[in-house]
């Protein structure tokens, strides 16, 4: 759809005569009839297939025609058409004399014709005004013409309909060739697809309006590029939704079992060295001067009985001092001035001379030690009790008092709640510090795997449109991760497919 515009510019009829040569009385009151039709190989009489238009009387004999377009007048003349502009045409312009006010063809004598032109033309849409001049022996007509498209029509022949819009069916304006130009923030064939927030993950995020980033199930974060870990995951991460990949030092289904108690809780005090010895268990190796399960107790330096051969220990600010009995000397009374002749071995120890009688050594009976068998053996000095057990001297023997959850001579054994096979249906039993936990096989759940459940929520392939299915282990349900272009709990709904022709 478009308009053929004809601008009459000047008509010259100096002698004021009709086509017959007869003069007009008093002058030629001139109006024009225009006929526009399809291109003819030879211009021939026939219907004005593209339209006709007439002017009022524009002047007498010779005159220039005013451009009246701005004032809503009739120059340029408008010949609208409702078809694809073919690019070529035939144009006939007749100049007539109006003796009276009635300009209808039937009201005029046939010899009222002043002049007639008939041309074949070629004209592209949107071309600049094309100027032409037709001269005869008596008259001259100057005119120009062009073709423009009607509102909402575009292209080389005004055949492309395009109406700007900003609604559910599209967000665009029209380019000169009729192609759509999307408004900022929109894309797609009909500009119906919003451009999401920059960086919004292509698969895991979507948007319903520009600069938005809405996350699909299982994803979170401003750009939907962070997966949501399994519900209840304590010390773990994920690379795909609903995973729980444990951080270092943690274990269990929810990464809530502490495998690195030393690092997470630093239980050993006073610079002691901590060693992990199992789930939530550890051993502290104390620095000299400290004792206790966590090396929390400070020892007097004399507590370690550093003075030998019956020397007595005196605490001092900067350490300790040994007062040696007669016949001994040295920092710890370790050097003897005695010989076997002086019966230096106590508690039934037997004396053996060394270095030709210059020195001696005592061989002590059980439960006694020291260079003179003067000390009762403390069987706890080697800290034999594992898993934080407390060592107690009981006469000639020793005993370990174990922490809860441990047993055995040296507290080396976990008290196993799993020994009585409490997990039903082939469940795997895990000892915990305060109880046990069953890991159930597929199809069973409950604290002891006693409840029969569906084998796998994803087994029935509930997700549509090639979505990825994840089983939510905590609820035995499934979650569908939709591919681009689909939404819904099962990815069953396409996102706003454009209709074939929105207008």
């Amino acid at each position: 759809s478009g308009v053929f515009q004809l601008q009459l510019q000047e008509f010259i009829n100096e002698r004021g005569v009709l086509a017959s040569g007869r003069p007009c009385e008093p002058g030629c009151r001139t109006f024009f009839r225009v006929c526009l039709k399809h291109f003819q190989a030879v211009v021939s009489p026939g219907p004005c297939t593209f339209g006709t238009v007439s002017t009022p009387v524009l002047g007498t004999n010779s005159f220039a025609v005013r451009d009246d377009s701005s004032g809503g007048g009739r120059n340029p003349l408008q010949l609208p058409f409702n078809f694809t502009w073919p690019g070529t045409f035939s144009l006939i312009i007749e100049a007539w004399h109006a003796p009276g006010d009635d300009l209808r063809p039937e009201a005029l004598p046939p010899d009222a014709l002043i002049s007639k032109i008939a041309i074949q033309g070629s004209l592209a849409v949107g071309q600049n005004w094309l100027l032409d001049e037709q001269t005869s022996t008596l008259t001259r007509l100057r005119y120009s013409y062009r073709v423009i498209c009607s509102d909402n029509y575009y292209g080389d022949n005004c055949s492309r309909l395009c109406k700007k819009r900003n609604d559910h069916f599209g967000h665009y304006v029209c380019q000169p060739d009729g192609n759509l130009s999307c408004l900022p923030g929109w894309t797609g064939e009909y500009c119906q697809q919003p451009i999401c927030l920059s960086g919004c993950h292509e698969q895991n995020g979507y948007c319903s309006k520009p600069a938005e980033c809405l996350c699909r199930p299982g994803w979170q974060g401003r750009l939907c590029n962070e997966c949501i870990p399994h519900n209840g995951c304590r010390h773990g991460t994920c690379s795909t939704p609903w995973q729980c990949t444990c951080d270092e030092g943690w274990g269990g289904l929810f990464c809530d079992q502490d495998l690195n108690y030393c690092t997470h809780h630093s239980p050993c005090k006073n610079g002691a060295t901590c060693s992990n010895s199992g789930q939530r268990s550890y051993t502290c190796t104390c620095r000299p001067g400290y004792t206790g399960v966590d090396c929390e107790l400070e020892l007097s330096e004399c507590d370690s009985n550093p003075c030998r051969n019956g020397g007595s220990c005196k605490d001092q600010e900067d350490g300790y001092h040994c007062l040696c009995p007669p016949g001994y000397y040295g920092l710890h009374c370790e050097h003897s001035t005695l010989s076997c002749a002086d019966s230096p071995c106590f508690n039934g120890g037997s004396c053996r001379e060394r270095n030709q009688g210059a020195n001696y050594a005592c061989e002590c009976p059980p439960n006694f030690t020291g260079s003179n068998c003067e000390k009762k053996v403390d069987r706890c000095t080697s800290n034999p009790c594992a898993n934080g057990g407390q060592c107690l001297n009981r006469g000639p023997s020793r005993m370990c008092r174990c922490r809860p959850g441990f047993t055995g001579t040296y507290c080396e054994l976990h008290v196993s709640d799993c020994a009585r096979n409490p997990c039903a249906h082939g469940g795997t039993c895990h000892d915990l510090e305060n109880g046990l936990m069953c890991t159930c096989p597929a199809g069973f759940s409950g604290r002891r795997c006693e409840v029969r459940t569906s084998i796998d929520a994803c087994a029935s392939s509930p997700c549509f449109n090639r979505a990825t299915c994840y089983t939510d282990l905590s609820t035995d349900t499934f979650v569908c991760n939709c591919p681009y272009g689909f939404v819904g709990s099962r990815c069953e709904f396409p996102v706003g497919l454009p209709p074939s022709f929105p207008w």
Epitope: Q40, S44, G46, I92, I117, A118, I119, G121, S136
Partner: antibody
């Protein structure tokens, strides 16, 4: 008096060129589309080429397309037909004509003979 | 291309006879058809244009009729000067095409 006078015809060898002219007088040459029509000896009429009044539109019959060129000089009231790569089948009397039946115009020249022969 | 089929190709008639020549177009050409008369060694002369309009100066014994695809030239009463070859020409679309001609001879 309306006159169209063709010139430039003659005998020419195949593959050679000729330029025909048509001088117009007695009417406003620049107002009308112009045509070349030919007639082989003993045969019927055959249209050859067309040019619109301002020279902006040209058409040719398929057999001469790319070999013949129609042009006009409105300041000299003259129509031309440049004929290249001539063939034996181009042998004919060539007429120029001004045709506009809407205006009752139908002017023809007397014709010029073109013979293509080795 | 539009084909123009003219008939008959030749015709013998006498002075005073009524003669009809027909032309058929291969597609609709509306009324865009002309009839020409040509005598040996002369240029064609326009008789009828727009299917039925008589050209200025042509005797009224010549008339044309038809539209669309079928057209007729009628000479109501043959005169000695009418013995010639007659052609139809369609002016609707390029390429312009003529009928093959009808040679009118004295019986």
């Amino acid at each position: 008096e309306v006159q169209l006078v063709e010139s430039g015809g003659g005998v020419v060898q195949p593959g050679r060129s000729l330029r025909l002219s048509c001088a117009a007088s007695g009417f406003t040459f620049s107002n009308y589309g112009m045509y070349w029509v030919r007639q082989a000896p003993g045969k019927g009429l055959e249209w050859v080429a067309f040019i619109s009044h301002g020279g902006g539109i040209t058409y040719y019959r398929d057999s001469v397309k790319g070999r013949f060129t129609i042009s006009r000089d409105n300041s000299k009231n003259t129509l031309y037909l440049q004929m290249n790569s001539l063939r034996a089948e181009d042998t004919a009397v060539y007429y120029c004509a001004a045709l506009n039946w809407e205006l009752g115009i139908d002017y023809w020249g007397q014709g010029t003979m073109v013979t293509v022969s080795s | 291309d539009i084909q123009m089929t003219q008939s008959p190709s030749s015709l013998s008639a006498s002075v005073g006879d009524r003669v009809t020549i027909t032309c058929r177009a291969s597609e609709d050409i509306y009324s865009n058809l002309a009839w020409y008369q040509q005598k040996p060694g002369k240029a064609p002369k326009l008789l009828i244009y727009a299917a039925n309009r008589l050209q200025d100066g042509v005797p009224s014994r010549f008339s044309g009729s038809g539209s669309g695809t079928d057209f007729t030239l009628t000479i109501s009463s043959l005169q000695p000067e009418d013995f010639a070859t007659y052609y139809c020409l369609q002016g609707s679309k390029f390429p312009l095409t003529f009928g093959q001609g009808t040679k009118l001879e004295i019986k």
